[in-house]
């Protein structure tokens, strides 16, 4: 299952950690996809490491763990964020976070 804070807030110009926690006794995480609405933020692969989308490369830092640190936030970053955990042999699990960026 995926456990996450469903709603988080942060100040404009600040940073926020996007984090989903996956728990399973048997399944291994092989890949994690992070998206802002339908736009790819980053992908973590157990075999290849991190790929951060070029449009976000100056503001998105991998970690902690399989989460993301989103920096230099703007009001336009307000919205839904999705983590998708690809696991073996457990299948695919999804989590949702709503980020509200507030004026500083």
């Amino acid at each position: 299952t995926i456990d996450t804070k469903r709603n988080i807030s942060a100040e404009e110009g600040g940073s926020v950690i996007l984090q989903c926690h996956f728990s399973s006794d048997t399944a291994e995480v092989t890949q994690v996809d992070w998206k802002q609405q339908d736009q790819l933020l980053a992908i973590y692969s157990v075999d290849l490491g991190w790929h951060v989308a070029s449009v976000f490369s100056d503001r998105v830092v991998p970690g902690p763990s399989l989460g993301l640190t989103f920096q230099s936030l703007t009001m336009n970053d307000t919205g839904e964020y999705f983590c998708t955990y690809h696991t073996y042999p457990g299948g695919i699990y999804k989590g949702r976070i709503f980020l509200k960026v507030q004026e500083s």
């Epitope: 092989t30 890949q31 992908i43 692969s45 157990v46 075999d47 290849l48 490491g49 991190w50 790929h51 951060v52 991998p62 970690g63 690809h86």
Partner: antibody, heavy 119, light 107 residues
Framework: QVQLVESGGGLVQPGRSLRLSCAAS????????MHWVRQAPGKGLEWVSG????????GYADSVKGRFTISRDNAKNSLYLQMNSLRAEDTALYYC????????????WGQGTMVTVSS | DIQLTQSPSSVSASVGDRVTITCRAS??????LAWYQQKPGKAPKLLIY???SLQSGVPSRFSGSGSGTDFTLTISSLQPEDFATYYC?????????FGGGTKVEIK
């Protein structure tokens, strides 16, 4: 024993294409990510491309992005590198390599196949 | 992309010497760093992965350390077969990248 054998290299003119192959044996190919690494004559190592076991994630060096395509056929235990719009600076020995599972060090390498781009 | 800077680019040493090679990453890469040895005309050989884990079959005189941005490969007592070129490689971010290499030569 674990073995990787590259083929398909040769002399090609600038702007033309070439397809490299890597035949894998001695391990369960479908369980592993795979990589291409190249080395220009007298120069250092350059990572070219990598692909996950199911082709779910693929990466390329900036120097080849948009020109080279990595692919695999798990049924044939084979890895491929399609090289288009070749340039003189692509001249190198191309190695196929297998990683230590989940640990990302490249522990098995082929003997390499030489690609020479020249008019 | 992550740049890896190796130093020195070459080193002259004698059998029995302790040799240290450093690799600095342009951004933090946790412990996702590997070290390779390459001899002329041969494919690279994996020595260390995960910054400090010794690959099976590699002599214990080789050791790796570091995390984040600064890493070290140490050969505690140089042997005749260790004269070669050594490369670091990061696997935290795509694209993976190699350092420029360090040639260990006979003094």
């Amino acid at each position: 024993q674990v073995q990787l054998v590259e083929s398909g290299g040769g002399l090609v003119q600038p702007g033309r294409s070439l397809r490299l192959s890597c035949a894998a044996s001695g391990f369960t190919f479908r369980d592993y990510a795979m990589h291409w690494v190249r080395q220009a004559p007298g120069k250092g190592l350059e990572w070219v491309s990598g692909i996950t076991w199911n082709s779910g994630l693929i990466g390329y060096a900036d120097s080849v992005k948009g020109r080279f395509t990595i692919s695999r056929d798990n049924a044939k235990n084979s890895l491929y590198l399609q090289m288009n719009s070749l340039r003189a600076e692509d001249t190198a020995l191309y190695y196929c390599a297998k990683p230590v599972p989940r640990l990302r060090g490249l522990d098995v390498w082929g003997q390499g196949t030489m690609v020479t781009v020249s008019s | 992309d992550i740049q890896l800077t190796q130093s020195p680019s070459s080193v002259s040493a004698s059998v029995g010497d302790r040799v240290t090679i450093t690799c600095r990453a342009s951004q933090g890469i946790s412990s996702w760093l590997a070290w390779y040895q390459q001899k002329p005309g041969k494919a690279p050989k994996l020595l260390i992965y995960g910054a400090s884990s010794l690959q099976s079959g590699v002599p214990s005189r080789f050791s790796g350390s570091g995390s984040g941005t600064d890493f070290t490969l140490t050969i505690s007592s140089l042997q005749p077969e260790d004269f070669a070129t050594y490369y670091c490689q990061q696997a935290f971010y795509l694209p993976w990248t190699f350092g420029g290499g360090t040639k260990v030569e006979i003094k």
